[in-house]
């Protein structure tokens, strides 16, 4: 039994399936979209070089009250191997650039198709 | 809600340079190939160049392959056309666009008006 349940028990997610998984709740988030996603907030433009998945984290972490991105805020941080809380300011940010939150979960769509593509998966 | 204006567009003689620029808001730049788009008067819309989003990757129409370059500064959310040796032929507006085969991630600006004559 002690053998077996090393078998039920879940193994690490493989990045290739973290990232597939990731696009497939981004394009949940955009084709269910109806009314304003999150009301219309606005959050950081993001640079997309390396530690962009913290980035994104950071600027969608400071939307509160927003249930349509919670899990994406919960999958991201599995992204970024460091603790982001709300409030931080990141290099990674494109200061004095925010916008919608609907067309941040957009553009960060196509860009996480883009890298799956290339196989880029970490 | 997503922008791209276009400037740099004018009355130029023929033999002549330019530079167009188009600075985008609304979206994160960085993440989209980009291009330019022409309509000559009278015309329809013929694509002149375009550049991949890390900005490593650009095709030219044979049209003005040797004489315009297409760039883009990530950091600065701002794509480039640099029009060299400029023929009448060039007249048209010029229109900065997204370049995704995605559905959905098609924006364009405005336009800017370039016009080739002595």
């Known amino acids: 039994l002690t053998c077996l349940g090393g078998f039920a028990s879940p193994g690490p997610v493989p990045p290739s399936t973290a990232l597939r998984e990731l696009i497939e709740e981004l394009v949940n988030i955009t084709q269910n979209q109806k009314a304003p996603l999150c009301n219309g907030s606005m959050v950081w433009s993001i640079n997309l070089t390396a530690g962009m998945y913290c980035a994104a984290l950071e600027s969608l972490i400071n939307v509160s009250g927003c249930s349509a991105i919670e899990k994406t805020q919960r999958m991201l941080s599995g992204f970024c191997p460091h603790k982001v809380s709300a409030g931080q300011f990141s290099s990674l940010h494109v200061r004095d650039t925010k916008i919608e939150v609907a067309q941040f979960v957009k553009d960060l769509l196509l860009h996480l198709k883009k890298l799956f593509r290339e196989g880029q998966f970490n | 809600e997503v922008q791209l204006l276009e400037s740099g567009g004018g009355l130029i003689q023929p033999g002549g340079s330019l530079r167009l620029s188009c600075a985008a808001s609304?979206?994160?730049?960085?993440?989209?190939?980009m291009g330019w788009a022409r309509q000559a008067p009278g015309k329809g819309l013929e694509w002149v160049s375009s550049?991949?989003?890390?900005?490593?990757?650009?095709y030219y129409a044979d049209s003005v392959k040797g004489r315009f370059t297409i760039s883009r500064d990530n950091s600065k959310n701002t794509l480039y056309l640099q029009m060299n040796s400029l023929r009448a032929e060039d007249t048209a507006v010029y229109y900065c666009?997204?370049?995704?085969?995605?559905?959905?991630?098609?924006?364009r600006g405005q336009g800017t008006l370039v016009t080739v004559s002595s």
């Open positions: 609304g979206f994160i730049f960085a993440v989209y190939d």
């Open positions: 666009a997204t370049a995704e085969d995605e559905p959905g991630y098609d924006y």
């Open positions: 550049i991949n989003d890390g900005g490593n990757v650009t």
